[in-house]
Interface confidence: low
């Protein structure tokens, strides 16, 4: 009988260590709510609504420094975890895809290809590269090709909307289509300087007999075939303080 | 029949090891998913479908490039050590928005930009930097801006009210609005010192024709662009007893 | 000096850290901006009688503790401060770190 | 430092890695593209005791621990990043770096 | 002090909609699920629709099509509307603070509405 | 669809006695404890007694427990009271927003 039931109790026992952690997980949640609010010097949560916080959270430089690198970091007392990493992902690269702009849409009545618009996030001085690829349609003959991008401005007095970013000049050979990249650093970094400054861009690609080859707007088939921006970005996590 | 229940509870035993194991796969699986969203900053898995993918990820070089060669790397880890900690939290940065006050409504009759209250247990002496952030408005031409933020004063037997913190001039050019900042350290580091004396301040940006562009009660979609004080302090925690 | 990781269903019953996560936006604290949840953890566990302890706190054993006689804690042997963006209710909002928030290693002692 | 290797099969008692893969297809996360799989694995086992400690917390333990005493712990002694590339739901595809989230050794601490 | 008020119409014809309005005092919607119940006479508790703190809305797979739950947090009201009414959904419809499976969800309910489907 | 099953459907005990209801799911509860406990009374609406599983809700007696994890989940009153005739009903959350009832098991009291 006696090792009967000292059986149960062992078996019960191994039970109510489950039971136990079950049983403790809110209230240690409710401990550590408690210990919070202490070590904050606060009696009590306060009070404060999301509609409230959407209205008092400055959109504001040190703020969003704040929040969007906002980073659980581990304190130089404590050499933090098994690694070498803070606990959030860092951003290497960015694939940026084009949206519709309202000032694209005005130039000349019909939405023209391309605005991209960007994360405040990203600072002009971690930029490392910048491409905006494009995609050529097949060529049926052997031809030269020149691709030409162009930034939006606002209009000058003589009428003028565009201004060069970039030209080149290339070679086709009949096949498939190709993608094409052209590097767009300076413009990126200016854009994120001058947010203001960003209206859009053309882009052309035009063959010897004038025909562009550029997808802009991709039609039946060239699903994936947008232009984008690839940009690559330094983030390098400082083993900071938590 | 001891042997026979010793050996059952070992069978048990090796069955509970293989179903705990199962059991647990899933909860697992479940707890990395939790954790990449929480890693990446997503509170929940973007929605998305993969017609969706089809069409927006580009088929081109770098998208090809980081798939195909795809890798997951492996850093070296570190490890961690003890914290020497106090109990309660420290403060590194206090952003401070403003409040109502009877004196700057008194002034003359209608509400006046801004007060700040703080609390006691910020010390002069630890005040690293205190910046006043304020939002001016955008602006339509190329403009001089005049800032002066003033500090009410109780009222001189010659009826002066308002005494000069800082004066700043800066150029604008049409496009978005602009924060600005002003070091305001000393008046700060006085007002903890004499708090009586923080009776609150007037902020004013006139532009060439006297229009206020600063945003000091902000109206309709002006939510976020209140002035606020950025006050980082230095609060080297004592190693305190508990 | 290390410590043991379990998960909730583990069937170790030896001292050992449990994940525990802290999500502020479960139950409506919508005054902590960041982080919204974090990884807290806990200790806990059995402890093999140590009759040198490094600490001479007292054991506190539970009146339903079936064997009745003290002996060494399962307790956090390591942590670490996080970094916290809030609303103090005083329309402020602070950036300070708060110290021993989160548990990284438990241990005997 | 090394660590046993183990399979789902195994009697080992003692502290191993096992091996976890976490398939994104097979739970519809379409929004990752690539990896579409990945080993994790996980550590799961039996500990020698240790008995000296560095904290001073008391662990109080819970009136239903049937036991109230504790010990070390089979866990991750060597982690490692994956890097992924994810669409991060505002149109943008990112390449970046996840920490913590292989599990490269097993070891008692 | 804190309380939930089911109120709307005690008799729906068939194929007509039924909404019920969910009135809360010393809660604030903008932090708070609120849960839909239902139990239909001599029968059990039967789980309608969530809508949460944030706004989503989770309904049960019975229901979906059929129901929709908002909330007019100014006005501190959860409305659950029901169309295509039939005999089957006479019940007591409860809300309740919270969801009742998740942590202290469910810790106070209304006193319920009975809703008779009949012609 | 999720399934929910408590039994005994009737359990009927004399004052003193202990009572264990039990309550299976189809599928495991989300973190193996998004599961609880209600009681009801007729004409009244349901009360909370557990939660996460086996934590007591706030003004609850002692007497009432919870145990269990995954699919198995189990409610305890040791010593049965008067009061404690009721209707218990297990409830169960699976993740994304999926939730579910028991048909419920009656306590009558002899």
């Known amino acids: 009988e006696n090792s009967e039931q000292k059986e149960n109790v062992e078996k019960e026992g191994l039970c109510n260590a489950c039971t136990w952690r079950q049983n403790t997980k809110s209230s240690r949640i409710e401990a550590i709510k408690i210990q919070i609010l202490s070590k904050l010097r606060l009696e009590t949560a306060p009070n404060i609504s999301k509609d409230a916080i959407r209205q008092l959270l400055p959109k504001a430089p040190p703020l969003r420094e704040l929040i969007d690198q906002y980073d659980v970091q581990r304190d130089d007392s404590s050499d933090g975890s098994l690694e070498d990493d803070d606990y959030h992902a860092t951003t290497e690269t960015i694939i940026t895809m084009p949206t519709e702009s309202d000032f694209l849409m005005q130039v000349d009545g019909k939405p023209k290809c391309c605005f991209f618009k960007f994360s405040s996030k990203i600072q002009y001085n971690k930029v490392v590269k910048a491409q905006l690829w494009i995609y050529l349609r097949p060529v049926e003959t052997p031809t030269t090709v020149f691709v030409q991008i162009l930034r939006l401005i606002k209009p000058m007095k003589d009428g003028t909307r565009y201004t060069g970013i970039r030209s080149l000049k290339l070679d086709m050979n009949p096949g498939t289509g190709i993608w094409q990249s052209i590097d767009v650093k300076t413009v990126l970094q200016n854009w994120l300087k001058q947010p203001e400054s960003n209206l859009g861009i053309e882009i052309k690609a035009l063959d010897e007999n004038g025909h562009d080859l550029a997808v802009t707007f991709p039609g039946p088939g060239e699903d994936g075939l947008n232009p984008f921006l690839e940009v690559k970005v330094t983030d390098t996590p400082k083993r900071s303080r938590r | 029949e001891n042997s026979e229940q010793k050996e059952n509870v070992e069978k048990e035993g090796l069955c509970n090891a293989c179903t705990w194991r199962q059991n647990t796969k899933s909860s697992r699986i479940e707890a990395i998913k939790i954790q990449i969203l929480s890693k990446l900053r997503l509170e929940t898995a973007p929605n998305i479908s993969k017609d969706a993918i089809r069409q927006l990820l580009p088929k081109a070089p770098p998208l090809r490039e980081l798939i195909d060669q795809y890798d997951v790397q492996r850093d070296d880890s570190s490890d961690g050590s003890l914290e020497d900690d106090d109990y309660h939290a420290t403060t590194e940065t206090i952003i401070t928005m403003p409040t109502e006050s009877d004196f700057l409504m008194q002034v003359d009759g209608k509400p006046k930009c801004c007060f700040f209250k703080f609390s006691s247990k910020i010390q002069y002496n630890k005040v690293v930097k205190a910046q006043l952030w304020i939002y001016l408005r955008p602006v339509e031409t190329p403009t001089t801006v005049f800032v002066q933020i003033l500090r009410l004063i109780k009222p001189m037997k010659d009826g002066t009210r308002y005494t000069g913190i800082r004066s700043l001039k800066l150029d604008m050019n049409p496009g978005t609005g602009i924060w600005q900042s002003i070091d305001v350290k000393t008046v700060l580091q006085n007002w903890l010192k004499q708090p009586e004396s923080n009776l609150g301040i007037e902020i004013k940006a006139l532009d060439e024709n006297g229009h206020d562009l600063a945003v000091t009660f902000p109206g309709p979609g002006e939510d976020g662009l209140n002035p606020f004080l950025e006050v980082k302090v230095t609060d080297t925690p004592k190693r305190s007893r508990r | 000096d290390f410590g043991l990781d379990c998960d909730e269903h583990s069937t170790e019953s030896r001292c050992c850290r449990y994940p525990l996560t802290v999500d502020f936006e479960a139950f409506g604290w919508d005054w902590i901006i960041a982080p919204k949840r974090y990884k807290a953890n806990y200790c806990s566990g059995e402890c093999e009688f140590v009759f040198l302890q490094k600490y001479p706190h007292t054991h506190l054993v539970h009146q339903a503790n079936p064997r009745g006689s003290a002996g060494p804690c399962c307790t956090p042997t390591k942590m670490s401060p996080i970094n916290m963006l809030y609303f103090n209710g005083k329309e402020q909002i602070i950036y300070g770190k708060i110290p021993a928030m989160v548990v990284d290693r438990c241990g005997c002692s | 430092d090394f660590g046993l290797d183990c399979d789902e099969h195994s009697t080992e008692s003692r502290c191993c890695r096992y091996p976890l893969t976490v398939d994104f297809e097979a739970f519809g996360w379409d929004w990752i593209i690539a990896p579409k799989r990945y080993k994790a694995n996980y550590c799961s086992g039996e500990c020698e005791f240790v008995f000296l400690q560095k904290y001073p917390h008391t662990h109080l333990v819970h009136q239903a621990n049937p036991r109230g005493s504790a010990g070390p712990c089979c866990t991750p002694t060597k982690m490692s990043p994956i890097n992924m590339l994810y669409f991060n739901g505002k149109e943008q595809i990112i390449y970046g770096k996840i920490p913590a989230m292989v599990v490269d050794r097993c070891g008692c601490s | 002090q804190v309380t939930l008020k089911e109120s709307g119409p005690v008799l729906v014809k068939p194929t007509e909609t039924l909404t019920l309005t969910c009135t809360v005092s010393?809660?604030?919607?903008?932090?708070?699920?609120i849960s839909w119940v239902r139990q239909a006479p001599g029968k059990g508790l039967e789980w309608v629709g969530i809508?949460?703190?944030?706004?989503?809305?989770y309904y049960a797979s019975w229901a979906k099509g059929r129901l929709t739950i908002s909330k007019d947090t100014s006005k501190n009201q959860v409305v659950l509307t029901m169309t295509n009414m039939d005999p089957v959904d006479t019940a007591t419809y409860y809300c309740?603070?919270?969801?009742?499976?998740?942590?202290?969800?469910?810790?106070?309910w209304g006193q319920g509405t009975l809703v008779t489907v009949s012609s | 669809d999720i399934v929910m099953t408590q039994s005994p459907a009737t359990l009927s005990l004399s004052p003193g006695e202990r009572a264990t209801l039990s309550c299976t799911s189809s599928q495991s509860v989300y973190h193996n404890n998004w599961l609880s406990w209600f009681q009801q009374k007729p004409g009244q609406p349901p009360k909370l007694l557990i939660y996460?599983?086996?934590t007591l809700a706030y003004g609850v007696p002692s007497r009432f427990s919870g145990s269990g994890s995954g699919t198995d989940f189990t409610l305890t009153i040791s010593s049965l009271q008067p009061e404690d005739a009721a209707t218990y009903y297990c409830a169960g959350g699976y993740g994304g927003g999926r939730y579910a009832f028991g048909q419920g098991t009656k306590v009558e009291i002899k």
């Open positions: 996460w599983a086996s």
């Open positions: 809508i949460s703190y944030a706004g989503s809305t």
């Open positions: 309740a603070r919270g969801v009742p499976a998740y942590s202290h969800g469910g810790d106070l």
């Open positions: 010393g809660i604030d919607l903008s932090h708070t699920d």
